[in-house]
């Protein structure tokens, strides 16, 4: 006999189910975006669901397959790149990840005119980076840390550099620290607009200390991974920039671009390169103490075959209250006159805004202004400037796209996205075709993401590119948590927070609270974006309230908040999380005996310090791959915010801000410490030192390591990680399994 409890309501609510951990780990509710691979003003390429590479012409409405899935499959290609003259396609296979952006791969060149792979003078393998010239079908590639050039795919290569050496000299690709903390790319070479010149960086890591860690693998003996990795205060890579004429590469060879004198006088970084014309290039440099940046515009001297960077074309950007720029120093977007440019930097009120620079930075014309921030300049045409900001309705965690008509006076501003799908879409990015003839808008939420195509002149929507219909249908019977974004005003500081509430949330009841924290300088956690993830599950199924708080040091709310943490990491970020928790308790629906905090990376550092704050607020917490001392982290990142770990600079705060210094304070909390042993970014050393300090202090704690896993803890480790953390939290909150 099967006894069925009677259904009280046969309503829709009863047919709906909560999220499960399995849903999250399987990626059941992941979404798709559509970024056209633009190849002209009105054409783009896209890889179809069945893996054909299809060319779409917006104006004719026609589309055709330029590369079949059969050809892709013949070499197991996972990526492709069409040459600008449309004669060849490179096919990328044997993808092998290195660091965050870098990977090696095997490349095959397919000739579209005869439908065959190019034979003879094949590319070596594995290649570290490969790209077409912007015009025609020249190829530049990096192999074994040296740069090679091919005039045509079938031609023999011309070797540009010869000094490349593993872990010593890097040509055309960045070393570890430049890749992760400065360029945020896998490449360090740049073609001029018409392919006449090729600029590249050479990084000399000869004197950099090496981080060495074991990679256990399956062999009898573990391998040792060695990475030149400058930690705070250590010797840094030495960088040089060269430019070679690709038409006559052997004529004068690579010519070095001079470094501005005020930069070269002490340790410095190269931060970015922007080509303006074929004979004008813009380089950005940064002092090692990262509050002074110099933008240098250099011209080709035909008579000497050299690059000249006159002092009159050096523009200095300096911060007196923090570091230069936001996370990175912004890059210029040049005007059609090929000398003046638009750039985002702090205005006199301490908000990042678009400025127009012609002769000097002092004479810059401010284009946007207000108590909000311009975030990205997408495109400048003869009559329009497209940018994103968080101006609309004063929500810092939104992103809308704006157009300023700069072809007339006074320039008029129009929000392109603010009212398109107001409830569904409040966080956009955009992708523009040549001359901004058309553009794609990609909306990330707060509703289900949607990608649309628009006319660049009228802003009219032409078509939906991706609307995630399957996801929408799949979510119809899911009890998703409720989300709200609000702010707390505390001591002249605005703390924005996102609260994720259980589906049947009742303000009169008490709920366990989990704080999810990142909190790193120039980060933002409170964003109006769609996500169905682990914390969604914790709210939906386990009845937790989850909160994310953007405290001091976070971005897009002005320099006062951003630079508050300058030279003082680990203080205000933690204070603001604690302040927010106290405010949440005052709201009346939080069970103050069941409050936890968790974070990853910088968030692991903040969660550890919050647990060790001695406030008694937190019952338990988790730190995944935390930084434990700023002396252990990368120079470029750490020194930007902390200065140098020297007596005459900021050593005292380096020492005071470690997790180890607070080992005693972990005695009254449940602490779960997690780290991958092959973390190239935040080294396992960080957690090893926390564990050692806790053991030495005879403090009990829980720990989990993931063998041979990096900072991302991917693959099967992800499933294990979230399952483990779920058990830990449920135990902490006394929730039954």
């Amino acid at each position: 006999i099967v006894l069925r409890p009677p259904r009280v309501h046969n309503s829709e609510e009863n047919t709906m189910r909560a999220l499960t951990l399995k849903d999250i780990l399987n990626g059941t509710f992941s979404y798709k975006t559509f970024f056209p691979n633009w190849i002209s003003g009105q054409e783009y390429l896209h890889q179809s669901a069945d893996n054909n590479i299809v060319l779409y012409n917006i104006e004719t409405g026609q589309s055709y397959t330029i590369l079949s899935n059969r050809t892709m499959k013949s070499v197991n290609a996972s990526n492709y790149g069409l040459s600008p003259d449309r004669q060849f396609v490179y096919l990328e296979s044997d993808y092998s990840k290195l660091w965050r952006y870098s990977y090696t791969a095997t490349y095959y060149i397919y000739d579209l005119s005869n439908g065959e792979f190019v034979r003879g003078n094949e590319l070596p393998r594995p290649i570290q980076y490969l790209c077409w010239s912007p015009v025609g079908s020249k190829l530049a590639y990096v192999y074994q840390n040296n740069i090679y050039l091919k005039q045509r795919p079938g031609d023999p290569p011309f070797q540009i550099t010869f000094n490349g050496r593993e872990n010593k000299i890097f040509n055309g690709i960045p070393d570890w620290v430049y890749e992760e903390e400065m360029l945020a790319t896998k490449y360090a070479l740049w073609w001029s607009p018409n392919g006449k010149f090729l600029a590249y960086a050479e990084f000399n890591d000869t004197d950099i200390p090496v981080i060495a860690y074991s990679y256990y693998g399956d062999e009898q003996y573990p391998r040792t991974i060695n990475i030149p990795y400058p930690k705070a205060g250590a010797k840094n890579p030495f960088v040089r920039i060269f430019i070679i004429d690709t038409t006559y590469p052997a004529y004068v060879g690579p010519q070095e671009v001079p470094v501005p004198a005020m930069i070269a006088s002490s340790d410095y970084y190269f931060s970015w390169l922007t080509w303006v014309t074929d004979e004008r290039v813009c380089l950005q440099w940064l002092k090692r103490v990262q509050n002074v940046s110099v933008l240098s515009i250099c011209d080709f001297r035909e008579d000497w075959q050299t690059w000249d960077c006159p002092k009159t074309q050096e523009h200095i950007e300096e911060s007196r209250t923090g570091w230069a720029g936001g996370f990175f120093v912004s890059t210029p977007v040049f005007s059609y006159d090929a000398i003046s440019y638009y750039k985002i930097f702090s205005d006199k009120d301490g908000y990042k805004h678009i400025h127009y620079i012609k002769d000097t930075v002092e004479n810059a014309i401010q284009i946007t202004s207000g108590k909000w921030e311009a975030i990205n300049i997408f495109r400048v045409t003869q009559d329009s400037l497209f940018y994103s900001s968080n101006e609309f309705e004063d929500y810092p965690g939104r992103r809308n796209i704006y157009r300023i008509s700069i072809g007339s006076y006074p320039p008029s501003k129009k929000c392109v996205t603010c009212h398109l799908r107001k409830e569904r879409c409040q966080y956009y990015t955009a992708s523009f075709s040549d001359y901004a003839k058309y553009y794609a808008l990609v909306c990330y939420g707060p509703g289900i993401p949607i990608s649309t195509l628009h006319d660049g002149r009228t802003d009219q929507e032409i078509k939906i590119l991706e609307e995630n219909k399957e996801l929408e249908n799949a979510l119809k019977n899911i009890q998703l948590p409720k989300e709200e974004i609000k702010k707390l005003e505390v001591d002249e500081i605005t703390l924005w927070y996102k609260m994720i509430l259980p589906p049947q949330f009742d303000r009169s009841k008490k709920y366990p609270l989990l704080i999810q924290v990142y909190g790193g300088p120039c980060s933002q956690s409170v964003r109006s974006v769609f996500a169905v993830n682990w914390i969604s599950y914790l709210a939906s199924k386990e009845g937790m309230v989850i909160a994310l708080v953007d405290g001091r040091g976070t971005a897009f709310q002005g320099d006062k908040l951003l630079y508050a943490v300058y030279r003082k990491l680990g203080v205000y970020e933690v204070e603001d999380q604690i302040t927010a928790v106290r405010k949440f308790i005052e709201m009346g629906f939080i069970d103050e005996k069941r409050i936890a905090i968790w974070g990853w990376s910088y968030g692991g550092y903040v969660s550890s310090l919050a647990l060790a704050s001695g406030t008694g607020l937190f019952k338990c917490g988790i730190a995944v791959a935390p930084v434990s001392s700023w002396e252990y982290y990368a120079s470029v990142y750490t020194e930007r915010f902390m200065g140098l770990p020297t007596k005459d600079d900021n050593l005292e705060h380096y020492k005071n801000s470690t997790v180890m210094a607070r080992a005693e304070y972990f005695r009254n909390v449940d602490y779960l410490l997690i780290h991958g042993t092959a973390d190239d970014n935040v080294h396992f050393q960080n957690s090893a030192q926390i564990a050692k300090a806790l053991v030495n202090a005879q403090v009990d704690f829980q720990a989990m390591w993931y063998s041979d896993q990096n900072h991302g803890l991917s693959g099967l480790s992800t499933n294990h990680l979230y399952t483990h953390m779920t058990h830990f939290l449920k135990q902490c909150f006394s929730l039954s399994d």
Epitope: Q313, D337, A338, K358, N363, P410
Partner: antibody, heavy 122, light 107 residues
Framework: EVQLLESGGGLVQPGGSLKLSCAAS????????MSWVRQAPGKGLEWIGE????????NYTPSLKDKFIISRDNAKNTLYLQMTKVRSEDTALYYC???????????????WGQGTTVTVSS | ELQMTQSPASLSASVGETVTITCRAS??????LAWYQQKQGKSPQLLVY???TLADGVPSRFSGSGSGTQYSLKINSLQPEDFGSYYC?????????FGGGTKLEIK
């Protein structure tokens, strides 16, 4: 039809002050950058300074920065040049000029007044 | 402060001739240059801006050229109404100085 009409010139003693006006008509004055230029008898043109549409930016030639003040009243469609501490070398024909916005952020002097004469003499 | 050096200071030419006036800047002005014509007793008139763009209503016999620090104004097939003084002016950085002028007289 665009018109710029200067007035206020005349004889002034060394060390004295004078305020020149430039009345604009025939165009949207409040969206134009405006400039003052002078021409000493038998000599070339000398740029004095400029003012942007909302008066938030005023630029001067360095040698005149401390004695001349450029201002505008958009409600009255009028540009002003306040001259102080004048000397004999300030004797000149004073022109006001305005012009089109040229992308990017640059203004030419398309329209000129007929000028007003300032004579500095004791 | 950028200096503008104009040459020649004066020149005589006949109707129908072609003349070229040059202007040298003491620094790179990146094509931010205008040319003006001023007739005796009259206000200056804009001829060329952005170094080579003719202002509205200016006859096509006038043409501007140059880059960097060197610029020139060319008048093809001189007409009687072209005689007068010519001035260059840069718009690169304030102060926007003028050249000393070139007086073009009928031969």
């Amino acid at each position: 039809e665009v018109q710029l009409l200067e007035s206020g010139g005349g004889l002034v003693q060394p060390g004295g002050s004078l305020k020149l006006s430039c009345a604009a008509s025939g165009f949207d004055f409040s969206t134009y950058w405006m400039s003052w230029v002078r021409q000493a008898p038998g000599k070339g043109l000398e740029w004095i300074g400029e003012i942007n549409p909302d008066s938030s930016t005023v630029n001067y030639t360095p040698s005149l920065k401390d004695k001349f003040i450029i201002s505008r009243d958009n409600a009255k469609n009028t540009l002003y040049l306040q001259m102080t501490k004048v000397r004999s070398e300030d004797t000149a024909l004073y022109y006001c000029a305005g012009g089109y916005y040229r992308y990017p952020y640059y203004y030419t002097m398309d329209y000129w007044g007929q000028g007003t004469t300032v004579t500095v003499s004791s | 402060e950028l200096q503008m050096t104009q040459s020649p200071a004066s020149l005589s030419a006949s109707v129908g001739e072609t003349v070229t006036i040059t202007c040298r800047a003491s620094g790179n002005i990146h094509n931010y240059l205008a040319w003006y014509q001023q007739k005796q007793g009259k206000s200056p008139q804009l001829l060329v801006y952005n170094a080579k763009t003719l202002a509205d209503g200016v006859p096509s016999r006038f043409s501007g050229s140059g880059s960097g620090t060197q610029y020139s104004l060319k008048i093809n097939s001189l007409q009687p109404e072209d005689f007068g003084s010519y001035y260059c002016q840069h718009f690169w950085s304030t102060p926007y100085t003028f050249g000393g002028g070139t007086k073009l007289e009928i031969k």
